[in-house]
């Protein structure tokens, strides 16, 4: 069937980067500037994506592939193929309808994007709080209170990455 189709349809011979030009007896014509065709046999070329404003060009458009965008510094990509750029906040904040707001007490965000998440509830695992949480960091859970009774083997916890309560510079 494929061979039959290619014999009947001259457009199937047009490679990527060209289109089958109906106005010129179905000759394979190169894609015009700022357009591309990523597969063979196309009857039109697609318009290249333009990276405007907060979007910057990560990969230029070619005759066979679309441009790719990412976000300028201070923004990060959202959605498939970076279809949106969202403003960063600081660690310890989340982006709301009214802008970047500090995480409420009992929640934290250790990234410049995303939402504030509740601190881990150590007691649910029968553990105690070893290091208090901050707006930027989750609590660190330690051994259960029973494990800390006299005579129990001591556990040396790993040192925290930085002093709790101090924001990153």
């Amino acid at each position: 069937f494929e061979r039959t189709r290619s014999l009947q349809d001259p457009c199937s011979n047009c490679p990527a980067g060209t289109f089958c030009d109906n106005n010129r007896n179905q000759i394979c014509s190169p894609c015009p500037p700022n357009s591309f065709s990523s597969a063979g046999g196309q009857r039109t070329c697609d318009i290249c994506r333009q990276c405007k404003g907060v979007f910057r060009t990560r990969k230029e458009c070619s005759s066979t592939s679309n441009a790719e965008c990412d976000c300028t510094p201070g923004f990060h990509c959202l959605g498939a193929g970076c279809s949106m750029c969202e403003q960063d906040c600081k660690q310890g904040q989340e982006l709301t309808k009214k802008g970047c707001k500090d995480c409420c007490f009992g929640t934290f965000n250790d990234q410049k994007r995303g939402i504030c998440r509740p601190w881990t509830n150590c007691s649910l695992d029968g553990k105690s709080v070893l290091v208090n949480g901050t707006k930027e960091r989750d609590v660190v859970c330690g051994p259960s209170p029973a494990d800390l009774s006299p005579g129990a083997s001591s556990v040396t916890p790993p040192a925290p990455a930085r002093e709790p309560g101090h924001s990153p510079q």
Partner: nanobody, 122 residues
């Protein structure tokens, strides 16, 4: 095609005022949310302000109570009244459509003007 043309930028002393305008064409302005962004020298973009088609307004913290966004649908125009200007407001200001309706978020289908320079210096 869609066109956004900003005007009204210039050199102003600290504490002074400027009114930026954005003339829109090529789309249904009255039903479109619009926004202002800025890019300071050597820095990234910053979302400044947005206005819904219905008139609800939003501002980034640093310009609240100093800047006022408004629109005139009859004239297909967007405005940014900037009062009590500070040196840190120095930037190129851009008018953009705001299809996401989300603070600090633009989509690839949004359109942008070429920008107008605002310099605040004594």
């Amino acid at each position: 095609q869609v066109q956004l043309v900003e005007s009204g930028g210039g050199l102003v002393k600290p504490g002074g005022s400027l009114r930026l305008s954005c003339a829109a064409s090529g789309f249904t302005f009255s039903s479109s949310a619009m926004s202002w962004a800025r890019q300071a020298p050597g820095k990234g973009f910053e979302w400044v302000s947005g206005i819904y088609s219905g008139g609800s307004t939003y501002y980034t913290e640093s310009v609240k109570d100093r800047f006022t966004i408004s629109r005139d649908n009859a004239k297909n125009s967007l405005y940014l009244q900037m009062n009590s200007l500070r040196p840190e407001d120095t930037a190129v200001y851009y008018c953009a459509t705001w299809g996401t309706l989300r603070f600090g978020v633009w989509a690839e289908y949004d359109h942008w003007g070429q920008g107008t320079q605002v310099t605040v210096s004594s």
